[in-house]
């Protein structure tokens, strides 16, 4: 099987959503957890994560082979405390398989704005709000 993990972000007004998306087969979901860590380069685990989510076991329809499970971590107002390095990870509690997404960062500037860097270019993201930018 092949399990794929991606990171993305979206902005709604002053809110910033950090999103971990895992694509997987139905039969691969059992015992899998996706989680988001901050400033944890080596010991990112569900226990040390900001948020965790069990993978979907049902895509809701029967005519598909793959399911996407999405963990969303919402920051209502980005502050200097949110600056840091983030990573989406997934782990199987059954098989011990561990997946690590790319690191991405939130940088809070002295002007009161912030940028999110390190996200994959293939994720098309547009901010309608000028408080934040993605690169």
């Amino acid at each position: 099987g092949c399990i794929n993990i991606t990171s993305s972000a979206s902005q709604e007004g002053t809110r910033l959503n950090l999103i971990c998306t895992v694509w997987h087969k139905k039969e691969e979901a059992e015992g899998f957890v996706v989680f988001l860590c901050k400033d944890r380069s080596g010991d990112c685990s569900p226990e040390t994560s900001l948020k965790q989510l069990r993978l979907k076991r049902d895509p809701g329809i029967d005519g598909v082979g793959e399911i996407s499970s999405q963990l969303m971590f919402t920051i209502s107002q980005v502050t200097p405390l949110h600056s840091g390095t983030y990573q989406c990870c997934a782990r199987s509690q059954k098989s011990g398989i561990r997946l690590q997404g790319h690191f991405f960062s939130i940088l809070f500037t002295e002007t009161g704005n912030y940028t999110v860097t390190g996200l994959k270019q293939r994720q098309h993201l547009e901010f309608s709000h000028n408080e934040g930018t993605l690169s």
């Epitope: 069990r54 979907k56 076991r57 049902d58 809701g60 329809i61 499970s69």
Partner: antibody, heavy 121, light 107 residues
């Protein structure tokens, strides 16, 4: 045992909004898709949408997009369906139903008792 | 979206007779079709899952068949409590859809 208990009947004026609740018990709420279906008087069943409480993934059929909002509260195992800009044609019985385990049941194996919505000026 | 067409709209039969209800999908849905029974004032009840699989607690006189686009619900010998409306529903793709229903009434 699995139970879905819906909120009581509602009477609303055209243009108003309504929020119907569906409290689930007897199973792991976050592991199953919750469906919303309606039935106008003397008519068939019409699927509105579904939500997966585990990650709040929601699907709403085109006809109701922009008017129907599906949410779920994990802490109380309650699903909600909010319908806005009500019109007389929205007068119907609204059901919540659980989709059974994929490839094992797949159909809607448990249903709420229904919530009657009357839209009238 | 997948359109499900049920026929006939009404079926007039006597107790003890065999009822054959049809559901046709606008495109192939494999066996991703389910049948429900609904009585007046009640919520629907799942009768058959995945076209032909039985449901615990549902009498053996109810059976389903078909795959692809053509499906059939058969009630081998109608009991008085079987007179109701029957709906098919597909779970193959979004949006999920129901057929328009077949009413089985007493002749």
């Amino acid at each position: 045992q699995v139970q879905l208990v819906q909120s009581g009947a509602e009477v609303k004026k055209p243009g108003a909004s309504v929020k119907v609740s569906c409290k689930a018990s007897g199973y792991t709420f976050t592991d199953f898709w919750m469906q919303w279906i309606r039935q106008a008087p003397g008519q068939g069943l019409e699927w509105i949408g579904a939500i997966y409480p585990g990650d709040d993934d929601a699907r709403v059929t085109q006809k109701f997009r922009g008017r129907a909002t599906l949410t779920a509260d994990k802490s109380t195992s309650t699903a909600y369906m909010e319908l806005s800009s009500l019109r007389s044609e929205d007068t119907a019985v609204y059901y919540c139903a659980r989709r059974g385990i994929a490839a094992v049941v797949g159909g809607f194996d448990y249903w709420g008792q229904g919530t009657t919505l009357t839209v009238s000026s | 979206e997948i359109v499900l067409t049920q026929s006939p709209a009404t079926l007039s039969l006597s107790p003890g007779e065999r009822a054959t209800l049809s559901c046709r999908a606008s495109q192939s849905i494999s066996n991703h079709l389910h049948w429900y029974q609904q009585k007046p004032g009640q919520a629907p009840r799942l009768l058959i899952k995945y076209a032909s699989q039985s449901i615990s607690g549902i009498p053996a006189r109810f059976s389903g068949s078909g795959s692809g686009t053509d499906f059939t619900l058969t009630i081998s010998s109608l009991e008085p409590e079987d007179f109701a409306v029957y709906f098919c529903q597909q779970s193959n793709s979004w949006p999920l859809t129901f057929g328009g229903g077949t009413k089985v009434e007493i002749k």
